[in-house]
Interface confidence: medium
């Protein structure tokens, strides 16, 4: 079975690598534009130069192309805590990241938010904070893990999952409650 190709891919596959087929004349292969540039005019004929122009400020192309326009530079999302790691150049998009001692939580494939790494107070660090993952904490006795923070077992209600981890404390609380009702 032949994989389905889009029109542009079909046209490009006729030409050797680094060239694309002229949109008005499929017997001509034009040289693609270098990264950092975009297609201003197709080559007029075989062996003649493609008219490529450099991307304007605020735009880029990161690979060889025959795009009619450069791509707009991404903006780091301040409301997501993102900071600019490197500015946009004509051949590279803005690189956004997080501050030191923060990690990225990806709400979706292309959007992340920065959060502070957990310090594991009342516990120990099981796995250190990574670029895309919070610290994994192990809690000391008398504490249970909630929202990746070690919380005192005195805050454990019977309905929560912490009951197994805080069983002795829960029983003590239950005993106190029972004695109060008799």
């Amino acid at each position: 079975l032949v994989p389905h190709l889009g029109d542009r891919e079909k046209r490009d596959s006729v030409c050797p690598q680094g060239k694309y087929i002229h949109p008005q004349n499929n017997s001509i292969c034009c040289t693609k534009c270098h990264k950092g540039t975009y297609l201003y005019n197709d080559c007029p004929g075989p062996g003649q130069d493609t008219d490529c122009r450099e991307c304007e400020s605020g735009s880029f192309t990161a690979s060889e192309n025959h795009l009619r326009h450069c791509l707009s530079c991404s903006k780091c999302r301040k409301e997501m805590g993102q900071v600019e790691i490197s500015s946009c150049t004509v051949d590279r998009d803005t690189v956004c990241g997080c501050r030191k001692n923060q990690y990225r939580h990806y709400w979706s494939e292309n959007l992340f938010q920065c959060f502070n790494c957990s310090l594991c107070l009342n516990g120990t660090v099981h796995l250190s904070c990574q670029e895309k993952q919070n610290t994994v904490c192990t809690c000391h006795a008398g504490f249970f893990l909630r929202e990746n923070e070690c919380v005192s077992c005195s805050n454990c209600k019977k309905s929560l999952e912490c009951t197994k981890l805080c069983l002795p404390q829960i029983e003590n609380v239950k005993g106190t409650e029972d004695s109060g009702t008799t």
Epitope: S74, K75, R77, W107, S108, L111, E147
Partner: nanobody, 119 residues
């Protein structure tokens, strides 16, 4: 048609509590990240809290951590924000938002509900 309808706002004294609700329709609620965002008078938007499709994970802005709790009931297509120990600086219009799937931000917003914290 996607609809997000917030309710539960009002006037409350400092230290008081409120529970906001957001009724969702027109999309598969149980598949979406959901968020609360707020806008204080004369200020920009501030992300408050977010929750994963199945109720986990939950995330909070530092300014509300330990005071606010986000939750959802997928059987009722409803998002909640329990706000305790309210402060004057929590005064804002609170919006429920769906998605956040691109560089452009949230897919859809509600019309907002006003929370006023004042004595």
């Amino acid at each position: 048609e996607v609809q997000l309808l917030e309710s539960g706002g009002g006037l409350v004294q400092p230290g008081g509590s409120l529970r906001l609700s957001c009724a969702a329709s027109g999309f598969t609620f149980s598949r979406e990240n959901m968020h609360w965002v707020r806008q204080a008078p004369g200020k920009g938007l501030e992300w408050v809290s977010g929750i994963g499709p199945r109720g986990m994970p939950t995330y909070y802005a530092d300014s509300v951590k330990g005071r606010f709790t986000i939750s959802r009931d997928n059987s009722k297509n409803t998002l909640y924000l329990q706000m305790n120990s309210l402060r004057a600086e929590d005064t804002a219009v609170y919006y429920c938002a769906k998605g956040m799937n691109s560089h452009d931000g949230f897919d859809y917003w509600g019309q907002g509900t006003l929370v006023t914290v004042s004595s």
